[in-house]
Amino acid sequence: IWELKKDVYVVELDWYPDAPGEMVVLTCDTPEEDGITWTLDQSGEVLGSGKTLTIQVKEFGDAGQYTCHKGGEALSHSLLLLHKKEDGIWSTDVLKDQKEPKNKTFLRCEAKNYSGRFTCWWLTTISTDLTFSVKSSRGSSNPQGVTCGAVTLSAERVRGDNKEYEYSVECQEDSACPAAEERLPIEVMVDAIHKLKYENYTSSFFIRDIIKPDPPKNLQLKPLKNSRQVEVSWEYPDTWSTPHSYFSLTFCIQVQGKSKREKKDRIFTDKTSATVICRKNASFSVQAQDRYYSSSWSEWASVPCS
Amino acid sequence: RNLSVATPGPEMFPCLHHSQNLLKAASNTLQKARQILEFYPCTSEEIDHEDITKDKTSTVEACLPLELIKNESCLNSRETSFITNGSCLASRKTSFMMALCLRSIYEDLKMYQVEFKTMNAKLLRDPKRQIFLDQNILGVIDELMQALNFNSETVPQKSSLEEPDFYKTKIKLCILLHAFRIRAVTIDRVMSYLNAS
């Protein structure tokens, strides 16, 4: 058992049939010595008396808010949560495995630039009695500060018969240099509590590996005289790190015809303009990636060819 | 082909081309090493990220773009011990900081060159002959060093008489290649920035 925060305790249980569970001793936070009784949650049933209460925690029915009373007045509370370990592996029932970029990916994080600001998100099908808290640092043995904001419900989606909820959090490294060469990874720890179940999820990454630029902006087409070619131009996204000559992007450009079967012509360029040929009903798209470190490509920015 | 992009003319800044080759070689060599050593801890998540140039050079700080010099988080350890001139420099316009920066890059390359050569000598004694560095990566390091054209005493290759631990040597190679790739990214950014300036 360990303290998650004041008056909230996590009991770690090996979860298998007929498991012995954990013996837990609760102590009433009071100078009183006599006439103390204990109850669990809203039930008025007295579980024991005395300054301490010893219980065997085996299942969720044994978890909850234990309260010690004297003369009808509550003296202190202890909330017990369960953290299940099955076959030596901590449970991951609350969050959905996003399977990207690999299996057992529960937290996904992205950064739009090298400023030390990043966003992490996770998915769940649970809609009620759910709370999250997030901590982050650079490195674990001698951690350097990262400040995270409040967790927000960022999206709701219908997936077949289920509703899926996306939660996200924004974090900022306290003293980040965009040009720095990262040697220690950022660690992100998410505590998830659903009713009386506690789970924790972690992710470890370098900012350079989670970079995903915003799409190029101000995409423009200029037709060339007596030709079905157009001069296309675009600009670096506003959110990308500066100076652009140091934090350079490379671009992938494509012309996509009206039918998905039609072959896509793709080329790569470091410039912010190109000459393309527009087919009927085609659209022109461009995406960006860090020129020197192959992290994610941005989403496509698109414009109709004509 | 339905798309066309004009190819750029020759770069004004002669080191840019060499730094691009350096990054390509660093990335390709690392990728190849990860494939060959797939059963060794050789991924970014598995290795310790060491920096053999730590406390010896200050490339990131010395080569900071002017726009980031105001950022206090970037100025933890300003090193100002190097000053000299080289053929990549645009002669009179060369600033003190630019000379310092290029000198620091040169020193990085020299250190990695020694480490890679020492490691290669060990790996060539491995009876499995599982992995060793091809001449490409050593060649591009050499080309960029020549383009930087700093006079520097040659560092002797470290020799070792005892039989190497090949497992440890291969892990060390992974660590070295990861670190070198990160430094090659910084070098390429710097050269691109200087070329644009």
Epitope: N226, R228, Q229, K258, I277, K280 | N2
Partner: antibody, heavy 119, light 110 residues
């Protein structure tokens, strides 16, 4: 920039025939080429086209009856099994624009070659 | 697609104005992929107007084109004897296979 059709002659029904359009002064890799025909005393009929990248398109009535192909300086129109209704002057015409859409303006035109199908 | 040209034939006097209409059974691509041609006996057609209203180079300014979508017009103002010919419209569509010429309008100058 010139175009010239050749291969027009008298053929019996069912005898395959290939007409050739030879171009000069421009590149077929940047221009779309069209075949158009005109029966005696009648109007113009678009048969089909081959685009700069080698893609082909045919009028609905012409599909399966005609095949268009090209080399670096020639464009061929193959008539698989001519009938008397295919008697006409056959023109090749270039797309007016570089990388023209199919259906874009046609300019210049060749002088035409006459095909007579008769038994 | 079917392109219907009216009227045919049309008679014109020198110095007068001739208007030829071209109606498409479906909207041409981007509302303007329509061109006009002039053909004289024994000659190949000659491009006059492209993109519905743009005059091809070397074509006298007395020729003009207008219209959009499915209705288009070729106008010859100040008709000259040399304008006696057959005029065709050509439409391009979303589906390349629908590309087609109109039936032609013969202009007789008296």
């Amino acid at each position: 920039q010139s175009l010239e059709e050749s291969g027009g002659r008298l053929v019996t029904p069912g005898t395959p025939l290939t007409l050739t359009c030879t171009v000069s002064g421009f590149s077929l890799s940047t221009y779309t080429m069209n075949w158009v025909r005109q029966s005696p005393g009648k109007g113009l009929e678009w048969i089909g086209a081959i685009s700069y990248d080698g893609g082909t398109a045919y009028a609905n009535w012409a599909k399966g009856r005609f095949t268009i192909s090209k080399t670096s300086t020639t464009v061929d129109l193959q008539i698989a099994s001519p009938t008397t209704e295919d008697t006409a002057t056959y023109f090749c015409a270039r797309g007016f624009y570089v990388y023209a859409y199919i259906g874009d303006a046609f300019d210049p035109w060749g002088p035409g070659t006459l095909v007579t199908v008769s038994s | 697609a079917v392109l219907t040209q009216t009227p045919s034939p049309v008679s014109a006097t020198v110095g007068g104005t001739v208007t030829i209409k071209c109606q498409s059974s479906q909207t041409v691509y981007k509302n303007n992929l329509l061109s006009w041609y002039q053909q004289k006996p024994g000659q190949p057609p000659k491009l006059l107007i492209y993109l519905a209203s743009t005059l091809a180079s070397g074509v006298p300014s007395r020729f003009s084109g207008s219209g959009s979508g499915t209705q288009f017009t070729l106008t010859i103002s100040g008709v000259q004897c040399d304008d006696a010919a057959t005029y065709y419209c050509l439409g391009g569509y979303d589906d390349d296979a629908d590309t087609a010429f109109g039936g032609g309008t013969e202009v007789v100058v008296v």
